[in-house]
């Protein structure tokens, strides 16, 4: 077919020779065709185009990819000739970097059902270059990990050496879907959940006097669960003395915050110190009162049926422990005056 009518887009892939890296091309068919074939899920219901010129099936894999050989030979079907390139729906995945990936890639609908469809195609001119030594030494990795339950960020590798202020506007995609609100070189995630993992693509435009092209980088983001490096901390009791009334019942609560551990063995117990003696107290079972991705807050109470004079001479100690270490908080009872 005649590709002279295809819309053209120029892309640059600068790959690091130090790391494994992938790349993607989206079949960015002109609107409104794009919505019908590939990125229907990028549109809100209010944005559905009024007419859909392609009346083929709604199958999201209804596009065909070709490479245009540089020697002028006929177009080659990607799937037959390039085992390191995989078509996933409307996206072309390059599994290995290399200058041999440079070239022109054309996508168009598989089913041509109307005269309009013939010109419905996109030609992507991809230039692939290894990163020069002069480039930023500490650029962000193409594989980034986010710690579940914590705050994290995803950096665009091709822009990670620039400050936010001098960074150009960035277009981000996650698993092929446009992230319309993200425009900076870094996506900040307030609290990481498992749905934050996926394939992120960041694009920005670079121009010279002759032409402009899109610089693209692909980031594989994993969400990982990290064991805490901190011993538990005691949230309550805060004070080391407590005013009490003799002869009255008393409940002292110990609340402790434990960070995540895959093999979670929290210890929370009360013991009593009386001069040189100390012994563990049999108290009600501990209970979890708050549970988040990051923290588990566990409470255990000590119950005195009635406070005696002897109790005023004792120290009541809450002891908490995880695999990292332990923390204690002691409470001395003091008779309420007046």
């Amino acid at each position: 077919f005649n590709i002279s009518g295809c819309s053209t887009k120029k892309l640059l892939w600068t790959y690091s020779t130090r790391s494994e890296e992938e790349f993607v091309l989206f079949c960015d068919l002109p609107e409104p065709q794009k919505s019908h074939f590939c990125h229907r899920n990028r549109l809100s219901p209010k944005q559905v185009p009024e007419h859909l010129p392609f009346m083929g099936s709604n199958d999201l894999s209804d596009v065909q990819w070709y490479q245009q050989p540089s020697n002028g030979d006929p177009l080659e079907d990607i799937r037959k000739s390039y085992p390191h390139i995989i078509q996933d729906k409307c996206t072309l995945h390059f599994l290995t970097p290399g200058v041999n990936n440079s070239g022109s890639y054309i996508c168009r609908p598989k089913m041509i059902k109307s005269p309009y469809d013939v010109a419905c195609c996109v030609k992507m001119i991809l230039e692939v270059k290894p990163q020069t030594n002069a480039s930023c030494e500490y650029s962000a990795s193409h594989k980034q990990d986010l710690l579940l339950g914590s705050t994290g960020s995803i950096s665009c590798p091709s822009l990670s050496c620039q400050s936010d202020a001098q960074s150009p506007a960035v277009t981000w995609y996650k698993n092929g879907k446009l992230l319309s609100v993200e425009r900076s070189n870094r996506i900040v995630v307030d609290e990481v959940y498992d749905y934050h993992q996926g394939t992120y693509v960041c694009d920005y435009t670079q121009s010279d006097t002759v032409s402009s092209w899109t610089v693209r980088a692909v980031v594989q983001v994993r969400t990982i669960v990290g064991d805490t490096k901190l011993k538990p901390d005691i949230l309550d009791p805060v004070e080391d003395t407590l005013e009490v009334e003799l002869g009255k019942p008393l409940t002292i609560s110990c609340k402790a915050r434990f960070g995540f551990e895959r093999v979670f063995n929290p210890v929370i117990k009360w013991y009593i110190k009386d001069s040189d003696l100390e012994w563990e107290v049999s108290v009600p079972e501990a209970k979890s009162i708050k549970s988040t991705l990051k923290d588990e807050i566990i409470e255990r109470n000590i119950i005195l049926e009635k406070v005696t004079q002897r109790d005023l001479r004792r120290k009541f100690v809450c002891f908490v422990q995880n695999s990292i270490g332990n923390t204690t908080q002691s409470v001395q009872l003091k008779e309420k005056r007046g």
Epitope: Q197, T223, D295
Partner: antibody
């Protein structure tokens, strides 16, 4: 060291009962989910039942609902699978496995498994 | 209930090959998908959790990814000890069909 040890398997007649035990050590089962997974001879893995003691939750596969009961005694660090009205198709190696169930009980995979106990239902 | 359709059911490969196994969920699921390796007469071993996170101690040649309802386990360069059966498994938070396993993929020596 984390360990799960199943016991209680054996030969039983159709319609009979059996109680499997899963003894846990090296972790606190209260803050874990314990799962029973079975594998019929030459077949794939099939989830049977789960219990999350800290959430007081139990779950069952449709194939065993009403016949099997999962329970846990956290003071003994042991989970149980009471199997009643056993059928020939319940013949399998039964594994107990654990997943973390603290910190919102997010699922991070069945990270520790027992060695399995064989249950044979035959007349 | 959510079904996990695993493919292929078996494959033959050589040491050094790149191997890809896919699981397709019958409906949209969370990323709570895990992959296991099982050798004959042994209990399964966890390889990947949360669709793409490598479990501690598992070699980095194993990786997991997600695209919509498709979950993929990739072994970048097959080693002699990798010949085994692999299972995917999804966990539906607070749903009756809590855990669902794929049918398994047996990786054999070519």
């Amino acid at each position: 060291e984390v360990q799960l040890v199943e016991s209680g398997g054996g030969l039983v007649q159709p319609g009979g009962s059996l109680r499997l035990s899963c003894a846990a050590s090296g972790f606190n089962p209260y803050y874990s989910s314990i799962h029973w997974v079975r594998q019929a001879p030459g077949k794939g893995l099939e989830w049977v039942a789960s219990i999350s003691p800290s959430y007081s939750s139990t779950y069952y596969a449709d194939s065993v609902k009403g016949r099997f009961t999962i329970s846990a005694d956290t003071s003994k660090n042991t989970a149980y699978l009471q199997m009643n009205s056993l059928r020939a198709e319940d013949t399998a190696v039964y594994y107990c496995a654990r997943s973390s169930c603290s910190h919102s009980c997010r699922f991070y995979g069945l990270d520790y498994w027992g060695q399995g106990t064989l249950v044979t239902v035959s007349s | 209930d959510i079904q996990m359709t695993q493919s292929p059911s078996s494959l033959s490969a050589s040491v050094g090959d790149r191997v890809t196994i896919t699981c397709r969920a019958s409906q949209s699921v969370s990323s709570a998908v895990a992959w296991y390796q099982q050798k004959p007469g042994k209990a399964p071993k966890l390889l990947i959790y949360s669709a793409s996170s490598l479990y501690s101690g598992v070699p980095s040649r194993f990786s997991g990814s997600r695209s919509g309802t498709d979950f993929t386990l990739t072994i970048s360069s097959l080693q002699p000890e990798d010949f085994a059966t692999y299972y995917c498994q999804q966990y539906a938070y607070h749903e009756p069909g809590l855990l669902t396993f794929g049918q398994g993929t047996k990786v054999e020596i070519k």
